[in-house]
Interface confidence: low
């Protein structure tokens, strides 16, 4: 006998990433005979579900399930019919549903039940809809990034597996309602809740991870809006010349703005709020999101959360990528250093509404929020996580790797379908009849 290749039959897996602002469906594929290889699973296709995230259907759970139908119909086309029954289908919900579960557990249960009901109607191997913990979201994002970049294990030209010397990459994810930081660390965590130990391909990894609920982009924008209403009566992060009617019920309905909620307020009242293009006041407003006053550990990131010093290279994805990409591509600003990132944020915050619209034609949605978004990303990385210039040099802002979206979804599927074994891979034996 000798080592042989079997016919390249493909297997498929589907993950619905139910985020706070929207849901994305990812279909993955891999050769059936190479399930335990690294870097073998790749993205086959994807689909963005129209409308808001499933947590936005708190008052209409059936609407949540119905919103998924278009993408599920696409999945029926994208996965060969003979593979439908053997294709695992997962739905994982993140911080939007974690927030809903805090404020209205009955509604979150109803949404998951409605979604489950619809997903079971399809011919795939449905394996559950659940809310991921912040820790899971962080770790699976880290697994995805390192799997795609082949940092766990590699197949050498001499025909054997080896562990690459470059080490693993840290992962930073900025979602709509939470943000996660995850990286390999040598020292044990002082806070056990922040440590995860993984055994992948015979290697042991000690990983630090933390998820900050209410520090996702959308919730940060809501919190800044609440602060602006409370302290200024104008919004220093919005461009001068931009004005909008703010419904107080919108601002204060999130648990993330609960602390800023006035004792008595009319939820149906509308307040006119204008921008002032003030980068310094905006920076102060963003600074107010972070607390550095008390730390029960030897060192903390912010809000009393333990974090070892950031080490090694990092990949920053989701809204980290979109924010930096806007600065780089739409605004034409350099962001290679922390200093440049800060200067770019100040530059955007200095623009009037007319200047911003002229500079970024055709992009109206969320345009007024890029100043706050950029200021937040810069402060989160430098002050929050403690990246200095040297460490920041090792951060890459990326949306995809190996034609696959970077996020928790792939890592989640790899874990649940046992596509990353704990043991080192061995060669399969077969008989060559040729």
């Amino acid at each position: 006998t000798r080592d042989v290749r079997e016919p390249p039959a493909l297997k498929y897996g589907i993950v619905l990433d139910a985020g706070s602002s929207h849901t994305s469906m990812f279909i993955y594929k891999w050769p059936a005979d190479k399930e335990n290889d690294t870097g073998i699973v790749g993205q086959h296709s994807s689909c963005d579900v129209p409308g808001g995230g499933i947590s936005s259907y708190a008052d209409n759970p059936s609407g949540a399930s119905q919103s998924l139908v278009g993408c599920l119909e696409q999945a029926l086309q994208d996965v060969p019919k003979e593979r439908h029954a053997g294709t695992p289908l997962y739905l994982g919900a993140t911080a939007g549903m974690r927030l809903l579960n805090l404020t209205n557990p009955e509604a979150s249960t109803s949404v998951l039940m409605a979604v489950t009901h619809t997903l079971t109607q399809y011919p795939f191997d449905f394996r559950g809809a659940r809310i991921l913990s912040g820790q899971e979201e962080g770790v699976f994002g880290w697994v995805t990034a390192n799997y795609l970049l082949e940092n766990f294990i590699k197949y050498g030209w001499v025909g054997r597996w080896f562990r690459p010397r470059k080490g693993t990459l840290g992962a930073m994810d900025l979602g709509g309602a939470s943000t996660q930081i995850t990286f390999e660390t040598t020292s044990p965590a002082e806070d056990r809740a922040s440590e995860v130990q993984l055994h992948l391909y015979g290697q042991h990894y000690r990983v630090y991870t933390h998820s900050f609920l209410c520090y996702g982009r959308d919730q940060v924008l809501q919190r800044l809006l609440a602060s602006a209403l409370q302290t200024h009566g104008f919004h220093p992060c919005w461009p001068r010349g931009f004005s909008t009617q703010v419904l107080l019920g919108d601002v204060y309905q999130s648990p993330c703005t609960m602390a800023q909620r006035p004792q008595n307020f009319n939820s149906s009242a509308r307040v006119s709020l204008s921008g002032s293009s003030d980068p310094h006041l905006c920076r102060d407003l963003v600074s107010g999101l972070f607390s550095f006053s008390s730390c029960p550990f030897s060192r903390c990131s912010f809000n009393g959360v333990f974090q070892p010093p950031v080490a090694g290279n990092f990949v920053a994805f989701s809204a980290f990528f979109y924010t930096v990409d806007f600065l780089r591509t739409s605004m034409g600003l350099p962001v290679a250093t922390l200093q440049q990132l800060e200067a770019a944020a100040v530059n955007v915050c200095n623009q009037t509404w007319a200047q911003l619209q002229a500079r970024v034609p055709g992009q109206r949605a969320r345009l007024a929020d890029y100043c706050a978004g950029a200021m937040f990303v810069q402060q989160l990385l430098s002050r929050g996580y403690g990246f200095d210039e040297r460490a920041f040099g090792g951060v890459i802002f990326q949306k995809k790797a190996a034609d696959t979206a970077v996020g928790w979804a792939l890592g989640y599927m790899l874990n649940l379908t046992n596509l990353i074994p704990a043991d080192p891979p061995g060669l399969r034996k077969g008989t060559d009849f040729s």
Epitope: G51, Y57, D59, V69, A107, D250, S267, S268
Partner: antibody
Framework: QVQLVQSGAEVVKPGASVKISCKAS????????MDWVKQAPGQRLEWIGD????????TYNQQFKGKATITVDTSASTAYMELSSLRSEDTAVYYC??????????????????WGQGTLVTVSS | EIVLTQSPATLSASPGERITLSCSAS?????IHWYQQKPGQAPRLLIY???NLASGIPARFSGSGSGTFYTLTISSVEPEDAAVYYC?????????FGGGTKLEIK
């Protein structure tokens, strides 16, 4: 203007089935879910279920599963509800109601903004 | 399922009087809608999402509340307000209605 016109009253025998209709006009039929609500004499309103005309997906209150079947004919902008194995306790006025909604910071909130005039179904031997 | 209890079951008021109808939920709900139903007619949306007046509804109607307790207030009752008023929740499957409060005008 937006209108929902339901079919006329029905008198049916126990064990039989009945199919009532709800014709919509004045709006794009596939843009809104259609719900059905039961009002038995002296009882509170009960939500039966709904249908999304765009995707032809219906959702039911557990209590009405097997009793009610909701369908649509999008070409006729009409929703239907069939009630089977009728018993005296199914005697009620049945309403179709359009599910209106408004967006509230990215969250859809729903309510019944337009109602049909109701169809009285009497189950009697 | 969430049970909505309305009180009082019947209320008699004179024109010009200010009245309050209440709706109590068996567990916390996000929002309540109110409907008005006159004899022989279909229900009509009065207030949506606790406090928003539906189109064409006079300003004498107002709603408030949160959690498990909600109210509908008519600041100055008119003869045409004689009807049954229902509260309705969309926070948890299945959507449910209250038993109704019948408003009679003296």
């Amino acid at each position: 203007q937006v209108q929902l016109v339901q079919s006329g009253a029905e008198v049916v025998k126990p064990g039989a089935s009945v199919k009532i209709s709800c014709k919509a006009s004045g709006y794009t039929f596939t843009d809104y879910n259609m719900d059905w609500v039961k009002q038995a004499p002296g009882q509170r309103l009960e939500w039966i279920g709904d249908i999304n005309p765009k995707y032809d997906i219906s959702t039911y209150n557990q209590q009405f599963k097997g009793k009610a079947t909701i369908t649509v004919d999008t070409s006729a902008s009409t929703a239907y509800m069939e009630l089977s194995s009728l018993r005296s306790e199914d005697t009620a006025v049945y309403y179709c109601a359009r599910r209106g909604f408004f967006l509230y910071y990215g969250i859809n909130y729903y309510y019944f903004d337009v109602w049909g005039q109701g169809t009285l179904v009497t189950v009697s031997s | 399922e969430i049970v909505l209890t309305q009180s009082p079951a019947t209320l008699s008021a004179s024109p010009g009087e200010r009245i309050t109808l209440s709706c109590s939920a068996s567990s916390s709900v996000s929002y309540i809608h109110w409907y008005q139903q006159k004899p022989g007619q279909a229900p009509r949306l009065l207030i949506y999402s606790t406090s928003n007046l539906a189109s064409g509804i006079p300003a004498r109607f107002s709603g408030s509340g949160s959690g498990t307790f909600y109210t509908l207030t008519i600041s100055s009752v008119e003869p045409e307000d004689a009807a049954v008023y229902y509260c309705h929740q969309w926070s948890s499957y299945p959507w449910t209605f209250g038993g109704g409060t019948k408003l009679e005008i003296k």
